[in-house]
Interface confidence: low
Amino acid sequence: TQNKALPENIKYGIVLDAGSSHTSLYIYKWPAEKENDTGVVHQVEECRVKGPGISKYVQKVNEIGIYLTDCMERAREVIPRSQHQETPVYLGATAGMRLLRMESEELADRVLDVVERSLSNYPFDFQGARIITGQEEGAYGWITINYLLGKFSQKTRWFSIVPYETNNQETFGALDLGGASTQITFVPQNQTTESPDNALQFRLYGKDYNVYTHSFLCYGKDQALWQKLAKDIQVASNEILRDPCFHPGYKKVVNVSDLYKTPCTKRFEMTLPFQQFEIQGIGNYQQCHQSVLELFNTSYCPYSQCAFNGIFLPPLQGDFGAFSAFYFVMNFLNLTSEKVSQEKVTEMMKKFCSQPWEEIKTSYAGVKEKYLSEYCFSGTYILSLLLQGYHFTADSWEHIHFIGKIQGSDAGWTLGYMLNLTNMIPAEQPLSTPLSHSTYV
C-alpha cells in the first residue's frame, strides 16, 4: 500500500465576475500555511453562468436567484463541505453594471440587492457584491498576471514556468478587453505621471510599483460594435447598412431601440425614420478598420501623449499580457502565436473578413452564429485598438502575449481581487520563503 500524505490544510475562495455579457464563477484554492507566498493560489474551476450579464436582469430581478443556482451548486460540490463556512464569496460587477448605474442608480442598486440576497442563501462566507471601478479592474488584472508569472517573487527560477516568462523581475503590462470596457495597465519607464487619475502606487512583497492604468468605458468589443453601428447608421441613406465589418452575404436585422438602449451610443443618437435596419455584410477589412478608427478621437490631447479621447498614455514599456476577449478572439482566429507578426495578423484578418458568410458558417459549424458573425469586427477592433488606440507598432507588437491561462488559472481581474480582499499579498517580503514554493504555482 502507498503511504498516504498527511491531509493538507487547503483554503478556498470564490469570485463571481459579473461582466457585461455573462457571469463567470471562479473557485481558487491554496495551502493555508503558504498564503503569503507568491504564486501559490490557483484556480480549480470556472463555471460559466448560463444567460446574459446581470445588468440584463433589470426588468426581471426575480430570475436572478435561478440564474446563479447552477454555478453556486457547482461550488458546493467542488469545495469540501467542511470548508463551506470559511470560504469567502465575492461578486464584482464591471462595465455592464457601470453603464446601468449611469442610466439609473436605483435600478443598479436593485439588481445588486437581489444578487446579494441570492448569494446570502448559500452556506459560504458571502462578502458582498459591488460594482468595481475601471481602475480596480485594470489594477487587479495586472496583479493577477504578474502574480501568476511569479514577477513578485524575489527568487530567480532556473527554469521558466511559461514560454514567455523571463527570469527578470520586470512586470508585464496588462491588456484586458471585455464586452463593455477595456483596460490598459503597466509600469511606465518614467515614474512621474502627468495624470494623477491614472496613477496607482502599490507596495507588494517589499517592492514599490508605480502603475499607470486606464479603463475605457464603452470600448469593450460589444459596446464598440454598438457605437460603430450607431455612428454608421447616421449616414445610411435608408434602412440598409452595408457594413464592411461583417462577412459578404451576412444579413441581420437590428432594432433601433436596441441600438440606442446603451449609454455608449448616446453621442451618436439621432432620430431615424425607421425602427429597424438591416446590416448587410460586405467583408472589407480596410474599410472596417477605417470605420473603427472613427470611434477614437485622436485630435485632442492635453498631455504629452494620449491614447484617444484625450486620455493620457505614457510611452509603452516592456511586455504585455493581453487576456480576456483579446485572447478569446485572437485564439479563435488562430493568431495568438508569438511567431505571427503584426503584418501577418493584418493579412490574415483581410482574408478572414472577405470570406463569404456561407463559407464561414460551414467552416465553423459548431460555433454559435451570433458569435461567429462578430469575429471579423472583433479582430479588426482589437488591431485598431492596439495599434492606433494604444500606439503599439509592428515592432512592439512582438511584446504582446495573448494569454488565456497561466498555469491553469485564467488571466483576468478576479484572482487579483481575491488576493487583495483576503490580504494574501503582503506589502513586505515574508521573512522565510519555503523552498517548495514553485510546486504550488
Partner: antibody, heavy 120, light 113 residues
Framework: QVQLVQSGAEVKKPGSSVKVSCKAS????????ISWVRQAPGQGLEWMGG??????NYAQKFQGRVTITADESTSTAYMELSSLRSEDTAVYYC???????????????WGQGTTVTVSS | GIVMTQSPDSLAVSLGERATINCKSS????????????LAWYQQKPGQPPKLLIY???TRASGVPDRFSGSGSGTDFTLTISSLQAEDVAVYYC?????????FGGGTKVEIK
C-alpha cells in the same frame, strides 16, 4: 450654461469664400452638435448643415459649397461658404442641436449671428 | 425633404387675447419608438437670434412663460399664446428635426391689433 460666441461681420466679394467661427464655452464641446442656420434679409430661417463628433452633414442646397468643421481643442466650430454670390448676403447663426445628432430638444442655444455681406 | 407650411403668414391680436399659429408637415414627424413628435417652435424678435420656445411639439423650454403652449401630433401642430403680451411681438417659426435636411416653416409674424 453653454454660450456660443460668433466671429464678427464680414464683407466679401462675389466668388470669394467666408469662414465664420462659433466658440462654445461653459459645456463639454465634444458633446455639442452644432448646426448652422442662415437668414437672408427679411426672409425666414434656413438650415445649412451641422457637425457633431467629427461628422458633418449638409443640406442638399449647399452641398459642395459649404464646409463645416470643429476644433475640439479650442471648442470652436467653423462654417466656410465658398463661391459667394450676392444672394448669400445673410445673417449666419450657429446653434446647439439639430444636425445628425438629433438635437432632441431642438436648437436650444444660439450664437449672436454673423452678418455676411456679399457685394462687388 | 419634409416641407413645413405655417399659417397664417401674419396675425394681429389684441393684448390679452389668444393667438394661434398652425404648422403642417408634409409627412409625420412622430417617432413611434419613443412616441415623440420631433417638432420645435422658435420666437425671433428683430435683430436677435431665434429663441427656442417648445420642443417635442408640446414641451416648454426652460424659462418660457406658461402662456406659450404647443399641441398636435403627426403632421398638424399648433402654437398658442393664451394671453398676448406686448413683448410677444415677434416672428414665430416651427421646425422639424425628424429627418434631414432639418426644415423650418416660413414664419408667422405676430403683431398687436
Amino acid at each position: 450654461q453653454v454660450q456660443l460666441v460668433q466671429s464678427g461681420a464680414e464683407v466679401k466679394k462675389p466668388g470669394s469664400s467666408v469662414k465664420v467661427s462659433c466658440k462654445a464655452s461653459g459645456g463639454t464641446f465634444s458633446s455639442l452638435p452644432i448646426s448652422w442656420v442662415r437668414q437672408a434679409p427679411g426672409q425666414g430661417l434656413e438650415w445649412m448643415g451641422g457637425i457633431g463628433f467629427g461628422t458633418a452633414n449638409y443640406a442638399q442646397k449647399f452641398q459642395g459649397r459649404v464646409t463645416i468643421t470643429a476644433d475640439e481643442s479650442t471648442s470652436t466650430a467653423y462654417m466656410e461658404l465658398s463661391s459667394l454670390r450676392s444672394e448669400d448676403t445673410a445673417v449666419y447663426y450657429c446653434a446647439r442641436g439639430g444636425a445628425k445628432y438629433a438635437g432632441r430638444y431642438g436648437m436650444d442655444v444660439w450664437g449672436q449671428g454673423t452678418t455676411v455681406t456679399v457685394s462687388s | 425633404g419634409i416641407v413645413m407650411t405655417q399659417s397664417p403668414d401674419s396675425l394681429a391680436v389684441s393684448l390679452g387675447e389668444r393667438a394661434t399659429i398652425n404648422c403642417k408637415s408634409s409627412q409625420s414627424v412622430l417617432f413611434s419608438s419613443n412616441n415623440k413628435n420631433y417638432l420645435a417652435w422658435y420666437q425671433q424678435k428683430p435683430g436677435q437670434p431665434p429663441k427656442l420656445l417648445i420642443y417635442w411639439a408640446s414641451t416648454r423650454a426652460s424659462g418660457v412663460p406658461d402662456r406659450f403652449s404647443g399641441s398636435g401630433s403627426g403632421t398638424d401642430f399648433t402654437l398658442t399664446i393664451s394671453s398676448l403680451q406686448a413683448e410677444d411681438v415677434a416672428v414665430y417659426y416651427c421646425q422639424q428635426y425628424y429627418l434631414y435636411p432639418l426644415t423650418f416653416g416660413g414664419g408667422t409674424k405676430v403683431e398687436i391689433k
